[in-house]
C-alpha cells in the first residue's frame, strides 16, 4: 500500500480539518514551548505543501517521508537553542534517528503556568470572534501540556469543546450551561491522557509484546462472544494505531484508526452485540464510543478451562509448538471468563502459567507438575480482591479527602525522596479511586481499581524517569509492568530514609490560603502533611490527625479574623511550634 | 435423548471435497471433546482426529492438511471437511464423544450411527 | 504407532471365557490409556472398558481388562449369545494425534 506521497495520502485521507489538527497537535507535542502563533504558521506552511502535493504528487520535496517533512519544518524555528537546549541538537540527525532524539526530549511534566479559565463572557466572545483560532488554541494549550495525549481523540475532544460553546453561548445562563461541561472535559481529559500515557510507556518501555497482552485481555472482556483469530487482528490493528501515535505518527495514527472503527462496524456479528449503537455515529464519536463499549454478555455453557489447559497431556506440545499463540490463547479464555478481575491480574495470571509451563515442560513427568497450575491462581486473585475491599472500607469510612490523606502518609513512608508536589498529585489521584470505584457493584470494583492505580502509578513512574530519587520506585516501575503495583503495595516503611530536616519557612501560611479554592486549600495542606511525614517519617496516624486537625482550626481561625494576615503571623509560629512538640 | 447423528455423505468424485456434520442433542457438545473415526466396508476402525473443548485439533498423520475438524457450539455441532478425496477415503465415517474434554483418550463413550461417504468416479 | 490384536480371529461356544490380547509398539499414555470396544454389524462401536480396566456405564461385569504399558487384555468371563461381534481395542498416547486402534478381533460361535 505505498503511495508517491505520503503527505498527499494523508490529507486525502484525513481531510483538511482534521490534517491541520493533528498536525497542530503534533507539533505541540513536540515543541511545547513554543508560542501559538508560532505553531500556527508552521502548520499553515505544512497544509500548503501538501495541498500542492495533492494537486501533484512529483512536485518536488512530495515523495519525503512525513518525519522528514515534518521534522524539517520544526527544525526551521529560529530560537531552537534557546528554548529548548540541547533539543536543538536532534536537528543535525538524520531520520529516523531525528525523530526518535525529539520524542526523548517530550516533557511529561513542561513547565507552563497552568490554564486559567477566563470569565465566560471573555470565553465566548473570543469563541465567536474566531472560532477556528479559538478551536486550535485549545488543540495547542492541551497537546503541549500533555504530549503523549491520544491525538484522534483530542480531536473528538475539541468537537466537544466546540459543542459546548455553540451551545452554551446561546443560552440565557451561559455559566450554568458552559462550566459544568467545561469541568467534564478537563476531567475526562486528564483520564484520557494519563491512560494514554500508560500505553505508550508499555510500548516503549516493555515492547509490543507487552502492549498486545494488555490488549488481548482487555479486548477479550469486552468481546468474549469474539473467536480469538478476530480479537487477533483487532489486537495487531490497535498494537499499529497505538504505536503510531506514541511515536509521534499521528496521520498514520488517526487514518488507522478510522480503519479500524470501519472494520468493526462492518464485522459487528463476530465481534460484539453491543458495537450497534456507536457505529451509527460520525467518525470521531464512533471510534470514541467503540474505545469505550461496554462489555458483551459471556456466552452460555464456555468449557472449563481445566480440559485444555491443565488436564490435556498434549498442553506441553501445544505450548512448545507455538508459545505466544498458546498463552495468547490461554489469556484470551481467561480474560473472556472473568470481565470481573483486572487486566493487570490477568496479566499476572498468563505470566504465572507461562511460568509453570516453563518449568513443567522441561520435568520428568510434565502432567503431574503443572497439574495444580491453576490453584497456585489463587493468591494472585486474593491478593487485588483484598486490596480492594481494605481500601473501599478505608474510603467509606474516611471520605475521599481523608483518604487521600491516608494515602499521602503511607506512599511518602514508603517513598520519601519523592518530591512532595508529585507525592501530593499522585496520592491525590490514588484516592480517587474511591469515588470512581468502591460504589460499583463488586463484580466491576477490581477491574476498575487495579486497572485506574496502574494508570496513576505509571505517572509516578513517568514523573520519576525524568528525576530519578529512589531506587525503590525505580524498581517498581521497570521490573514487570504487570507487577507495578503489588510492587508498590509491597513497600514497607523506607528504614534508610535520613528524615527532612525541619524547615520553618515549609509551614509558614499568609492570608492568601483564605481566598483559595476548596481544593487548592486541601493542595497546600496536603502539602503541609507530606513535609511533615518526610520530617517525622515514624510519626504515628494519631500524631499526625492531632497535627492536621489543629492546622484546620488554625487556618479557619485566622481567616475569620479581621486581620488576617496579623493573625498568621502571631498564630503560625505558634502552631508549629506545636506541632513539633507533639512530633518530638 | 442423548445422540449424535452424521449428515453430509453420499457420492462425491475423486478429487472433491465433503463436509460432514454431526449434530449433538441431549447434551451440549461443550463439554467433551469431540472425535471423528472411519470404517472402511469390510474393514477396521481408523482414528481421524478430535477437536477439544477449547478449539484444539488433532489429527492422525495421514489426514493432516487434507481433513479440517471445527466445531460450533452454539449450534452443538462438530464438522469434518474432507478435501481431494481419493477412492481409498470411502468409508462409513462416525463422529464420537471423547471421555476426555481437552484431549484424546481413545475412550469414546457415544458415537453416531455413522454417514456413508463414496468416492468415485 | 502400531495396535496388534491377537487373534483376528476367533471361534468360541457359549459360557467359554475368551481373552483377546492387544499389544502396542510404544507405551500407552499413562501406562493405562486403552480401551476396548465392541463392534455389530451395522452398528457403530461401543466402549466396554477405558482406562485398561475401567468398566464403561451400562457393560456386563462379565467383561473384564487388564494389563499395563504395551501389553493388555479383554477377558470375557462366560460368553453370551449377544457378545459375538468383533472386538477393538484403542489406545491414546503422549500426543492425541497418536490416537490408535488395533485391527480387530472377530469372535464367531464355534461350530
Known amino acids: 500500500d505505498t503511495h508517491k506521497s505520503e503527505v498527499a495520502h494523508r490529507f486525502k485521507d484525513l481531510g483538511e480539518e482534521h490534517f491541520k489538527g493533528l498536525v497542530l497537535v503534533a507539533f505541540s507535542q513536540y515543541l511545547q514551548q513554543c508560542p501559538f502563533e508560532e505553531h500556527v504558521k508552521l502548520v499553515n506552511e505544512v497544509t500548503e505543501f501538501a495541498k500542492t502535493c495533492v494537486a501533484d504528487e512529483s512536485a518536488e520535496n512530495c515523495d519525503k517521508s512525513l518525519h522528514t517533512l515534518f521534522g524539517d519544518k520544526l527544525c526551521t524555528v529560529a530560537t531552537l537553542r534557546e528554548t529548548y537546549g540541547e533539543m536543538a541538537d536532534c536537528c543535525a540527525k538524520q531520520e529516523p534517528e531525528r525523530n526518535e532524539c525529539f520524542l526523548q526530549h517530550k516533557d511529561d511534566n513542561p513547565n507552563l503556568p497552568p490554564l486559567v479559565r477566563p470569565e465566560v463572557d471573555v470565553m465566548c466572545t473570543a469563541f465567536h470572534d474566531n472560532e477556528a483560532t479559538f478551536l486550535k488554541k485549545y488543540l495547542y494549550e492541551v497537546a503541549r501540556r500533555h504530549p503523549y495525549f491520544y491525538a484522534p481523540e483530542l480531536l473528538f475532544f475539541a468537537a466537544r469543546y466546540k459543542a459546548a460553546f455553540a451551545e452554551c453561548c446561546q443560552a440565557a445562563d451561559k455559566a450554568a450551561c458552559l462550566l459544568p461541561k467545561l469541568d467534564e472535559l478537563r476531567d475526562e481529559g486528564k483520564a484520557s491522557s494519563a491512560k494514554q500515557r500508560l500505553k505508550c510507556a508499555s510500548l516503549q518501555k516493555f515492547g509490543d509484546r507487552a502492549f498486545k497482552a494488555w490488549a488481548v485481555a482487555r479486548l477479550s472482556q469486552k468481546f468474549p462472544k469474539a473467536e480469538f483469530a478476530e480479537v487477533s487482528k483487532l489486537v495487531t490493528d490497535l498494537t499499529k494505531v497505538h504505536t503510531e501515535c506514541c511515536h509521534g505518527d499521528l496521520l498514520e495514527c488517526a487514518d488507522d484508526r478510522a480503519d479500524l472503527a470501519k472494520y468493526m462496524c462492518e464485522n459487528q456479528d463476530s465481534i460484539s452485540s453491543k458495537l450497534k449503537e456507536c457505529c451509527d455515529k460520525p467518525l470521531l464519536e464512533k471510534s470514541h464510543c467503540l474505545a469505550e463499549v461496554e462489555n458483551d454478555e459471556m456466552p452460555a455453557d464456555l468449557p472449563s478451562l481445566a480440559a485444555d489447559y491443565v488436564e490435556s497431556k498434549d498442553v506441553c506440545k501445544n505450548y512448545a509448538e507455538a508459545k505466544d499463540v498458546f498463552l495468547g490463547m490461554f489469556l484470551y479464555e481467561y480474560a473472556r471468563r472473568h470481565p470481573d478481575y483486572s487486566v493487570m491480574l490477568l496479566l499476572r495470571l498468563a505470566k504465572a502459567y507461562e511460568a509453570t509451563l516453563e518449568k513443567c515442560c522441561a520435568a520428568a513427568d510434565p502432567h503431574e507438575c503443572y497439574a495444580k497450575v491453576f490453584d497456585e491462581f489463587q493468591p494472585l486473585v486474593e491478593e487485588p480482591q483484598n486490596l480492594v475491599k481494605q481500601n473501599c472500607e478505608l474510603f467509606e469510612q474516611l471520605g475521599e479527602y481523608k483518604f487521600q490523606n491516608a494515602l499521602l502518609v503511607r506512599y511518602t513512608k514508603k517513598v520519601p525522596q519523592v518530591s512532595t508536589p508529585t507525592l501530593v498529585e499522585v496520592s491525590r489521584n490514588l484516592g480517587k479511586v474511591g469515588a470512581k470505584c468502591c460504589k460499583l457493584p463488586e463484580a466491576k470494583r477490581m477491574p476498575c481499581a487495579e486497572d485506574y492505580l496502574s494508570v496513576v502509578l505509571n505517572r509516578l513512574c513517568v514523573l520519576h524517569e525524568k528525576t530519578p530519587v529512589s531506587e525503590k520506585v525505580t524498581k517498581c516501575c521497570t521490573e514487570s509492568l504487570v507487577n507495578r503495583r503489588p510492587c508498590f503495595s509491597a513497600l514497607e516503611l523506607d528504614e534508610a530514609y535520613v528524615p527532612k530536616a525541619f524547615n520553618a519557612e515549609t509551614f509558614t501560611f499568609h492570608a492568601d490560603m483564605c481566598t483559595l479554592s476548596e481544593k487548592e486549600k486541601q493542595v497546600k495542606k496536603q502539602t503541609a502533611l507530606v513535609e511533615l511525614v518526610k520530617h517525622k517519617p515514624k510519626a504515628t496516624k494519631e500524631q499526625l490527625k492531632g497535627v492536621m486537625d489543629n492546622f484546620a482550626a488554625f487556618v479557619e481561625k485566622c481567616c475569620k479574623a479581621d486581620d488576617k494576615e496579623a493573625c498568621f503571623a502571631e498564630e503560625g509560629p505558634k502552631f508549629v511550634a506545636a506541632s513539633q512538640a507533639a512530633l518530638a | 435423548e442423548v445422540q449424535l447423528v452424521e449428515s453430509g455423505g453420499g457420492l462425491v468424485q475423486p478429487g472433491g471435497s465433503l463436509r460432514l456434520s454431526c449434530a449433538a442433542s441431549g447434551f451440549s457438545l461443550s463439554s467433551n471433546a469431540m472425535g471423528w473415526v472411519r470404517q472402511a466396508p469390510g474393514k477396521g476402525l481408523e482414528y481421524i482426529g478430535i477437536?477439544?473443548?477449547?478449539?484444539?485439533?488433532y489429527y492422525a498423520s495421514w489426514a493432516k492438511g487434507r481433513f479440517t475438524i471445527s466445531r460450533d457450539n452454539s449450534k452443538n455441532t462438530v464438522y469434518l471437511q474432507m478435501n481431494s478425496l481419493r477412492a481409498e477415503d470411502t468409508a462409513t465415517y462416525f463422529c464420537?464423544?471423547?471421555?476426555?474434554?481437552?484431549?484424546?483418550?481413545?475412550?469414546?463413550?457415544?458415537w453416531g450411527q455413522g454417514t456413508l461417504v463414496t468416492v468415485s468416479s | 504407532i502400531q495396535m496388534t490384536q491377537s487373534p483376528s480371529s476367533l471361534s468360541a461356544s457359549v459360557g467359554d471365557r475368551v481373552t483377546i490380547t492387544c499389544q502396542s509398539s510404544?507405551?500407552?499414555?499413562?501406562?493405562?490409556?486403552l480401551s476396548w470396544y465392541q463392534q455389530k454389524p451395522g452398528q457403530p462401536p461401543k466402549l466396554l472398558i477405558y482406562d485398561a480396566s475401567d468398566l464403561a456405564s451400562g457393560v456386563p461385569s462379565r467383561f473384564s481388562g487388564s494389563g499395563s504399558g504395551t501389553d493388555f487384555t479383554l477377558t470375557i468371563s462366560s460368553l453370551q449369545p449377544e457378545d459375538f461381534a468383533t472386538y477393538y481395542c484403542a489406545g491414546g498416547f503422549s500426543s492425541s494425534s497418536d490416537t490408535a486402534f488395533g485391527g480387530g478381533t472377530k469372535l464367531t460361535v464355534l461350530g
Open positions: 477437536i477439544s473443548v477449547g478449539g484444539f485439533t
Open positions: 510404544e507405551s500407552v499414555y499413562s501406562n493405562n490409556q
Open positions: 464420537a464423544r471423547d471421555r476426555h474434554g481437552g484431549d484424546s483418550s481413545g475412550a469414546f463413550y457415544l
